[in-house]
């Protein structure tokens, strides 16, 4: 679990792009808006995030969707799918 810390000035992510790979885990937690992440999930697969950084992104989605991810997110999980547990997948309402 990444500790909750305020996002440093000027580091709030305006979009999901390659510059985020330079963020430390706590910066990803503090500076990436979960709703923005959810709407730009299709970009994540093309960005070389580390295994540990993907953990943070998953944590953000889990907080945004505690009852399970919507289909719009599930369709674009890409490598984040590797982070999903059977418990996570059971929450999905996929048609």
């Amino acid at each position: 679990e990444v500790e909750k810390t305020a996002c440093p000035s000027g580091k709030k992510a305006p979009e999901i792009d390659e510059s985020l790979i330079f963020y430390k885990k706590w910066e990803l937690e503090a500076c990436v808006d979960a709703a923005l992440l959810a709407t730009q999930m299709d970009r994540v697969n093309a960005i070389p995030f580390t295994y540990e950084q993907l953990d943070v992104l998953k944590h953000k989605l889990d907080e945004l969707y505690p009852q399970g991810y919507p289909e719009s997110v599930i369709q674009h999980l890409g490598y984040l799918f590797l982070k999903m547990s059977p418990e996570d997948i059971r929450k999905w309402n996929v048609t």
């Epitope: 995030f49 993907l54 490598y79 590797l82």
Partner: nanobody
Framework: QVQLVESGGGLVQPGGSLRLSCAAS????????VAWYRQAPGKEREAVAV???????KYADSVKGRFTISRYNAKNIAYLQMNSLKPEDTAVYYC??????????WGQGTQVTVSS
């Protein structure tokens, strides 16, 4: 299984230069972003440079103006030109793509030591 092999590291004096190479055994570079990372003893692995599939480049603040990332898709090679090296650049350097980094699969890396 795609293999990434990093080379070009060594011992260099402060202010010196090195060029690191990353060779891939498969054609994973074309159509994918490639990044260079480094890990110093006792520290987390951190990204230092990335080049997108379109050739756009981005750098960590700590190396901006000193490091240059490039790629040669036809030969599945990526490079990291490192100039004005500092002692704090000492680390093992790795390259990777989204697929490899996502599953925590890394090459052996190449050691860079900056010391007088």
């Amino acid at each position: 299984q795609v293999q990434l092999v990093e080379s070009g590291g060594g011992l260099v004096q402060p202010g010196g230069s090195l060029r690191l190479s990353c060779a891939a055994s498969g054609s994973i570079f074309s159509g994918n972003a490639v990044a260079w990372y480094r890990q110093a003893p006792g520290k987390e692995r951190e990204a230092v440079a990335v080049i997108t599939r379109d050739g756009d480049t981005k750098y960590a603040d700590s190396v901006k103006g000193r490091f240059t990332i490039s790629r040669y898709n036809a030969k599945n090679i990526a490079y990291l030109q490192m100039n004005s090296l500092k002692p704090e650049d000492t680390a093992v350097y790795y390259c990777n793509t989204a697929r490899g980094a996502a599953v925590d699969s890394w090459g052996q890396g190449t050691q860079v030591t900056v010391s007088s």
